[in-house]
């Protein structure tokens, strides 16, 4: 029997390598049964997760799952770090695993990864 609890499908220890200056969408896949929960994003600062208030977010609905998306337009160097999404469901707070963004600053060509490094790095298939 499928659980009717809200479930947030971010993998533990997941990582994304992205380029500063590019647009990027960070997805929080959300499974729920009836009413869509209120979902927020926060960014980890040590052990506390600071809520991201004035950031562009959107929902994308698919057949069996919904995605709460945090938009980076564009990615900035200080977007580097770990993020977590949280859902309020029946007065319970459900937290996802954190996912880490590694931002490469394209201004410094010497910091750009080589082709070999790129092959072994988590470049997104977006």
């Amino acid at each position: 029997k499928e659980s009717c609890d809200v479930q947030l499908y971010i993998k533990r220890q997941s990582e994304h390598s992205i380029l500063a200056g590019d647009p990027f969408e960070l997805e929080c896949p959300v499974k729920y049964c009836a009413n869509r929960p209120h979902v927020t994003w926060c960014k980890l600062n040590g052990t506390t997760c600071v809520k991201l208030e004035d950031r562009q977010t959107s929902w994308k609905e698919e057949k069996n799952i919904s995605f709460f998306i945090l938009h980076f337009e564009p990615v900035l160097p200080n977007d580097n770090g770990s993020y977590r999404c949280s859902a309020n469901f029946q007065s319970n707070l459900i937290e996802s695993h954190s996912t880490t963004l590694y931002v490469t600053d394209v201004k410094s060509a010497s910091e750009r990864p080589s082709k070999d490094e790129m092959a072994s790095r988590p470049w997104l298939l977006y």
Epitope: Q7, Y9, R12, S14, R121, P122
Partner: antibody
């Protein structure tokens, strides 16, 4: 039925390369991390590294970095371990395993494939 | 790297008796999400390993309830409450809190 089947093992000469495959079925590979482990004859288990088939991210044990490449084809539900510059001490049974990435709900192992490095 | 040390290296226990295997890590396995990613594997002779226990104490589906796991921080225990003949195996603890993931050296469980 869940299955992980490793293939590609066998006898290989020192200095050569080998690509092992791990064919999976019965679950969505993109919901998991694919790990490769190895076990030398009569010895314990060693983690080689892991791949996230959803985005290609890989992690390795330091001793395998630069010599091993783990990849996955999510559309075919197959993962790979490419090992270069093989040495006699790489002789081992190599296992792939698939661990659910969100809630640890399962951890499946393949039956293993024996790689023998010898001249 | 985190060093995982199991004790004893081998253990002989009579059928129906309790078997206890210990695992100690060189640093805490408590992750920042508040969970502890310590697993126990069973490897029977000539077979591939099988996950028995994850998150210290959660039994994998189909694992008999005579198996249990406990512990926190750096000290963990696998207990078999009443040893059965089919429990003859090597048992490994492994941690996937910190990269690189590491294993204990294994404990060989034999029937006395």
């Amino acid at each position: 039925e869940v299955q992980l089947v490793e293939s590609g093992g066998g006898l290989v000469q020192p200095g050569r390369s080998l690509r092992l495959s791990c064919t999976t079925s019965g679950f969505n590979i993109k919901d998991t991390y694919i790990h490769w482990f190895r076990q030398a004859p009569g010895k314990g288990l060693e983690w080689v590294g892991r791949n996230d088939p959803a985005n290609g991210n890989t992690k390795y044990t330091a001793s395998f970095k630069g010599r091993a490449t783990i990849s996955a084809d999510g559309s075919k539900s197959i993962a790979y371990l490419q090992m270069n510059s093989l040495k006699t001490e790489d002789t081992a049974v190599y296992y792939c395993a698939s661990y659910e990435g969100y809630y640890e709900r399962f951890g499946y192992w393949g039956q293993g494939t024996l790689v023998t490095v010898s001249s | 790297d985190i060093v995982m040390t199991q004790s004893p290296d081998s253990l002989a226990v009579s059928l129906g008796e309790r078997a206890t295997i210990n695992c100690k890590s060189s640093q805490s396995l408590l992750d920042r999400d508040g969970k502890t990613y310590l697993n126990w594997l069973q490897q029977k002779p000539g077979q591939s390993p099988k996950r028995l226990i994850y998150l210290v104490s959660k039994l994998d589906s189909g694992v008999p309830d005579r198996f249990s796991g406990s512990g926190s921080g750096t000290d963990f225990t696998l207990t078999i409450s009443s040893l059965q003949a089919e429990d003859l195996a090597v048992y490994y603890c492994w941690q996937d809190t910190h990269f690189p993931y590491t294993f204990g050296q294994g404990t060989k469980l034999e029937i006395k």
